[in-house]
């Protein structure tokens, strides 16, 4: 089989601070040295890019400075964290993995992680 399998959790609940973390694991058919990981958000059949990072195997995952994502890599596993989430960001977050180099190129698309975000209740004023 030439397809690359990508696994990610079905559901994740964001913290009260709007932070969600999940693991994206891929079964590499080859020995890739350069990997690109992209987080996509799917809502109403529209797909948008949340963040992306390219890394060399054995090196750290580096997202752009203004990215809402951070992550670490270990072998064929990527630990992703998305920050600054609000209730309106609740949705399906898909992990996309591309083995860029060396040939052949492989594409792997996860089934998506449903991230639920609940905005924290504002603290009531204290009466003393």
């Amino acid at each position: 089989c030439k397809a690359m399998h990508v696994a990610q959790p079905a559901v994740v609940l964001a913290s009260s601070r709007g932070i969600a973390s999940f693991v994206c694991e891929y079964a590499s058919p080859g020995k890739a040295t350069e990997v690109r990981v992209t987080v996509l958000r799917q809502a109403d059949s529209q797909v948008t890019e949340v963040c992306a990072a390219t890394y060399m195997m054995g090196n750290e995952l580096t997202f752009l400075d203004d990215s809402i994502c951070t992550g670490t890599s270990s072998g064929n596993q990527v630990n992703l964290t998305i920050q600054g989430l609000r209730a309106m960001d609740t949705g399906l977050y898909i992990c996309k993995v591309e083995l860029m180099y060396p040939p052949p190129y492989y594409l792997g698309i996860g089934n998506g992680t449903q991230i639920y975000v609940i905005d924290p209740e504002p603290c009531p004023d204290s009466d003393f």
């Epitope: 089989c1 992306a52 860029m100 492989y106």
Partner: antibody, heavy 118, light 108 residues
Framework: EVQLVESGGGLVKPGGSLRLSCAAS????????MHWVRQAPGKGLEWVSF????????YYADSVKGRFTISRDNAKNSLYLQMNSLRAEDTAVYYC???????????WGQGTMVTVSS | EIVLTQSPATLSVSPGERATLSCRAS???????LAWYQQKPGQAPRLLIY???SRATGIPDRFSGSGSGTDFTLTISRLEPEDFAVYYC?????????FGQGTKVEIK
């Protein structure tokens, strides 16, 4: 408007060279991989070449390897295909296509005709 | 290289009827990585189906895709006059990216 527009096609003699361009607009060009696909007269679609987001990774069909070079300029939202040592069998309509976020080629240009003949 | 074989080469159907197109892969293709395109004379291909069964934006629901592994199907439930065209399947899960040879759907 989200679109791709190819240019640079024409008539060239065998052994000659041609450079195709593809101008992208209406989307963040650097967030997508890009491809060239060709179609010989009356024939099916044949993938020609791929280029990664930053242009560092390139792949080619065996039929064009060593003769064609793909490149991109993200600052100019442009994709290119440099075609050298052209042969009669390279005669085709050449399309640039966007590798969609989920992988399929979700946006195509209108195509540019390349004819290799003496 | 994954070779995609489409059948039949030509399908003659009357408007309003159902059309069933087949695409067989030489080795297993993950269902997430199989697409169908429509091409009309003088036009560029247009994405219809991706991920074997998901309709692309703006594609009417008379088009549906199914299948997994090595066997995939594109079904057009009720052919409209504008549906007569050539249809290609494609795998995009690994390089080289490959297309089937196409199925021409013509008016009977």
């Amino acid at each position: 408007e989200v679109q791709l527009v190819e240019s640079g096609g024409g008539l060239v003699k065998p052994g000659g060279s041609l450079r195709l361009s593809c101008a992208a607009s209406g989307f963040t060009f650097s967030s997508y991989t890009m491809h060239w696909v060709r179609q010989a007269p009356g024939k099916g679609l044949e993938w020609v070449s791929f280029i990664s987001y930053d242009g560092n990774t390139k792949y080619y069909a065996d039929s064009v390897k060593g003769r064609f070079t793909i490149s991109r300029d993200n600052a100019k939202n442009s994709l290119y295909l440099q075609m050298n040592s052209l042969r009669a069998e390279d005669t085709a309509v050449y399309y640039c296509a966007r590798g969609g976020l989920l992988g399929p080629f979700d946006l195509w240009g209108q195509g540019t005709m390349v004819t290799v003949s003496s | 290289e994954i070779v995609l074989t489409q059948s039949p080469a030509t399908l003659s159907v009357s408007p309003g009827e159902r059309a069933t197109l087949s695409c067989r892969a030489s080795q297993s293709v993950g269902s997430s990585y199989l697409a169908w395109y429509q091409q009309k004379p003088g036009q560029a291909p247009r994405l219809l189906i991706y991920g074997a069964s998901s309709r692309a934006t703006g594609i009417p629901d008379r088009f549906s895709g199914s299948g997994s592994g090595t066997d995939f199907t594109l079904t057009i439930s009720r052919l409209e006059p504008e549906d007569f065209a050539v249809y290609y399947c494609q795998q995009y899960g690994s390089s080289p990216w490959t297309f089937g040879q196409g199925t021409k759907v013509e008016i009977k």
